[in-house]
Amino acid sequence: TLNSVLINSNAIKNLPPPLGGAGGQPGSAVSVAPGVLYEGGNKYQTLDNYQPYPCAEDEECGSDEYCSSPSRGAAGVGGVQICLACRKRRKRCMRHAMCCPGNYCKNGICMPSDHSHFPRGEIEESIIENLGNDHNAAAGDGYPRRTTLTSKIYHTKGQEGSVCLRSSDCAAGLCCARHFWSKICKPVLKEGQVCTKHKRKGSHGLEIFQRCYCGEGLACRIQKDHHQASNSSRLHTCQRH
């Protein structure tokens, strides 16, 4: 029905009801919260100048900055890191984020990312945003690294929590699955982890929180000690073939 939502398809067990319903069992259908009907950049003002801006990753810096220790080229080295001005064309670099927009890091040098340099058909435009630290990049007034990437040369795969469109956008060991109303990279399930077995295609309701599929060599089967349980509450886990 319209107001029935499957909250736990391939979601983690003991899920708190996301839409005001009861229960967190895999596949449990819940009613939508009262007052809700299912139908089936701002650049923020800064509170102060706060310069130089400390950071933990490139995504926390502006589009023309990268995150690094002031005295070192690479981020992640000990000491406080701050947002530094991007490197212009032909300057030395260690990663793409160090280069100014329109450039990328190739062989340690910032080069122009002019697509005309690449053979036709080799370009796969793909915008991957790292959501690992979920909100740092975009919400207040930051800029995520929005870069048009070439698949063969410097395609960055989404890490866990990155917004994705398909599983091929995600790094190894991750798949693209629904989370709330969006899609993010989530871990592929390991042996013993709870999974969701759909009886028939199209039979499941609205899946607010999807889990990934079981990893290689694993299948989603009823957990042996749950055979006696009622049909509706049988627990499925990833098991060896």
Partner: antibody, heavy 114, light 112 residues
Framework: QVQLVESGGGVVQPGRSLRLSCAAS????????MHWVRQAPGKGLEWVAV????????YYADSVKGRFTISRDNAKNTLYLQMNSLRAEDTAVYYC???????WGQGTLVTVSS | DIVMTQTPLSLSVTPGQPASISCKSG???????????LYWYLQKPGQPPQFLIY???NRFSRVPDRFSGSGSGTDFTLRISRVEAEDVGIYYC?????????FGQGTQVEIK
């Protein structure tokens, strides 16, 4: 630059319609669920509607159901809110908002008055 | 709906002094993904919400470190270690774990 820009607000008579737009840029719009939230003059925020990343699933607040329709065009990176049968109590600044990594637009003012 | 209750509703602070705002939710905001979907934002007259804190304690980029958030489950606190003149406005908490998103009534912060 990562941003959401709303447009389409204005003064409209009760019972009439208005369509709001929200242009997204700088992020993978088609991967995010998008929301509309409104704020009546001098009041707090009120959640209005949500649409899933692919546009297939939509939810509405009771106060607007049957009158408002949320939609999106991922090819154009645009979110819409079609508002029909407008009432005086719909007067508010309407914000579009991105979920997960919360981002809001500057808002567009809708005034329903005879 | 999840009810969000803020206290106090107004706060008058001397510049340089600390300030603290409480927010209580009607049910736990802890999700099974391990995140707690509680936000703090500031709104100034005629401006959109300016987000300060996400997931209870994480500062959005460019937010000064005098702002900090804490709490878990249903009880949350926003602290400003040293209030500055530009910090005036209405502070709101918000939850996004469940539809509809709901908001606290707001705490008006003014300078003495």
């Amino acid at each position: 630059q990562v941003q959401l820009v709303e447009s389409g607000g204005g003064v409209v008579q009760p019972g009439r319609s208005l369509r709001l737009s929200c242009a997204a840029s700088g992020f993978t719009f088609s991967g995010y669920g998008m929301h509309w939230v409104r704020q009546a003059p001098g009041k707090g925020l009120e959640w209005v509607a949500v649409i899933s990343y692919d546009g297939n699933d939509k939810y509405y607040a009771d106060s607007v159901k049957g009158r408002f329709t949320i939609s999106r065009d991922n090819a154009k990176n645009t979110l819409y809110l079609q508002m029909n049968s407008l009432r005086a109590e719909d007067t508010a600044v309407y914000y579009c908002a991105r979920e997960l990594r919360v981002l809001w637009g500057q808002g567009t003012l809708v005034t329903v008055s005879s | 709906d999840i009810v969000m209750t803020q206290t106090p509703l107004s706060l008058s602070v001397t510049p340089g002094q600390p300030a603290s705002i409480s927010c209580k939710s009607g049910q736990s905001l802890l999700h099974s993904d391990g995140k707690t979907y509680l936000y703090w934002y500031l709104q100034k007259p005629g401006q959109p919400p300016q987000f300060l804190i996400y997931e209870v304690s994480n500062r959005f980029s460019r937010v000064p470190d005098r702002f900090s958030g804490s709490g878990s489950g249903t009880d949350f606190t926003l602290r400003i270690s040293r209030v500055e003149a530009e910090d005036v406005g209405i502070y709101y908490c918000m939850q996004s774990i469940q539809l509809p998103w709901t908001f606290g009534q707001g705490t008006q912060v003014e300078i003495k």
